[in-house]
Interface confidence: medium
């Protein structure tokens, strides 16, 4: 059910493209294609190519993205395009000028002197933005989200975007300065992963990050299952980067117990993050006794 045909506006197309990209990434990383047939991988790649081509129709002259060409470009959506295209670049041919043009726009047009990324064109499909939808601590969570996207594009774009390392450092410094005052577990998790990517998730931030976990296994807000899956997935990625393999098993167990296999309204971020995190887990912890995921993927019938 994750391998779907992308369609619609610049936001809907990304909603459709997300699950296919992450499903292929997950099955590649965990070497599970034999369950579905290797020919299915090729079909999935065709859908990703289609999504990529369709998304280019929403690229504005500035290299940024919006739901429609007559709307102001969105910081969040452009960062998300960067994130998905960076992952897809391992699967299909992505024009680096397209990807790095979006990175350049984020840095030159949307980053303030204090390192914060600002949003001047909020997305229409608010259900696609996950835990960021809660307006509290939006500056930190958006800055962390963009920073993570920039880090994921770094290998491809560092040569084309001279200001990329400096931008990442500025954003990281802002997150560091704000981190100890964060209240939302979601923000603590996403910002914690952003810091971990910079090798800065150390004391006192590490203690705050770990202490925010409820019962040592989840970064949770009441009655927000999708946000909690997303947040805990960010946290798992941070723990894996830290090589804190003692803290990892209870987190993986909790994610596994959610029996969340993606898809459904409002699931874009939770789907992307849970499969990114579990793929990374199975790569970093090959002897993964804590994970027994019965994942099923369905290709659309032609």
């Amino acid at each position: 059910h994750l391998i779907v045909t992308p369609a619609g506006c610049g936001e809907q197309n990304m909603i459709g493209m997300t699950p296919t990209v992450i499903a292929v990434h997950y099955l590649d990383q965990t070497e599970q294609w034999e369950k579905f047939g290797i020919e299915k991988r090729q079909e999935a790649l065709e859908l990703i190519k289609k999504g990529y081509t369709q998304q280019l129709a929403f690229k504005q002259p500035s290299s940024a993205y919006a739901a429609f060409n007559n709307r102001p470009p969105s910081t969040w959506l452009t960062a998300y395009v960067v994130k998905v295209f960076s992952l897809a670049a391992n699967l299909i041919a992505i024009d680096s000028h397209v990807l790095c043009g979006a990175v350049k726009w984020l840095i030159l047009e949307k980053q303030k002197p204090d390192g914060v990324f600002q949003e001047d064109g909020p997305v229409i499909h608010q259900e696609m933005i996950g835990g960021f939808r809660n307006a509290k601590e939006a500056d930190v969570s958006l800055t962390a989200f963009v920073l993570i996207a920039l880090q994921e594009a770094r290998d491809i774009c560092e040569g084309q975007v001279n200001s990329l390392p400096g931008s990442i450092n500025k954003a990281g410094e802002y997150i560091e300065a704000s981190y100890m005052n964060l209240q939302r577990p979601y923000t603590v998790a996403i910002a914690g992963y952003a810091l971990a990517l910079m090798n800065k998730l150390e004391e006192p931030y590490l203690g705050k990050f770990l202490n925010t976990a409820k019962d040592r296994n989840r970064w949770e807000e009441p009655d927000q299952q999708l946000y909690n899956v997303e947040a805990t997935s960010y946290a798992l990625l941070a723990l894996l980067l830290l090589k804190d393999f003692d803290s990892v098993p209870p987190v993986v167990r909790w994610l596994n117990e959610q029996r969340y296999y993606g898809g459904g309204y409002g699931s874009t971020q939770a789907t992307f993050m849970v499969f990114q995190a579990l793929a990374q887990y199975q790569t970093d912890v090959p002897d993964h006794k804590d994970l027994n995921m019965d994942v099923s993927f369905h290709l659309p019938s032609r």
Epitope: P204, D215, R216, D246, S247, P249
Partner: antibody
Framework: QSLEESGGRLVTPGTPLTLTCTVS????????LGWVRQAPGKGLEYIGW??????AYYASWAKGRFTISKASSTTVDLKMAGLTTEDTATYFC????????????????WGPGTLVTVSS | DPVLTQTPSSTSAAVGGTVTIKCQAS??????LAWYQQKPGQPPKLLIY???DLASGVPSRFKGSGSGTQFTLTISGVQREDAATYYC??????????FGGGTEVVVK
Amino acid sequence: QSLEESGGRLVTPGTPLTLTCTVSGFSLSTYTLGWVRQAPGKGLEYIGWIDSSGSAYYASWAKGRFTISKASSTTVDLKMAGLTTEDTATYFCASGNTGGDPLYYGMDPWGPGTLVTVSS
Amino acid sequence: DPVLTQTPSSTSAAVGGTVTIKCQASQNIGRWLAWYQQKPGQPPKLLIYRASDLASGVPSRFKGSGSGTQFTLTISGVQREDAATYYCLGSYSSSDSAFGGGTEVVVK
């Protein structure tokens, strides 16, 4: 930084009792506080702790019978119900070492303790 | 609740010697373990937190190690003032935490 427990006394079984931990030199609005007890001649037993926002966490055996609450920025109460002779112990309060979870950063410093005796 | 098994329950060492105390958790507790020292008639004192981090003001002869389920407190170059009972406190979650049974250290 110092802590002091008060309220310990001789009570009969079933009598509720509230102990108070008073801190000086720091504020509970930024620090956590834990409770531990020790029966005469026995080892230490963890009861629970309260974070700076007032959320309390308990050892599973203490849930329901013990309640930790913040009375002010310098005092925390430990309310005990349904006391039995098994609850006879010295009760200690201790601050979280850094303001974080005392189970992660450890508890330091400690109060001198207050003795609760449950006897018929 | 996790069970923390401390061994030995009692040990002795000469001044300048080495003492090793082990704490085994019944389930993986990562690095969520602290060591405390208690002398008769006094409250406990924090020695080590997060399995291996030395608390402020604690002499460097105290060393904590381990993670997961196996932890060790080592006192190298034991001094007379180290005679005390030592406890580990492990935490699997906020509601699953327990002390070990204690180890009495006698200095000869």
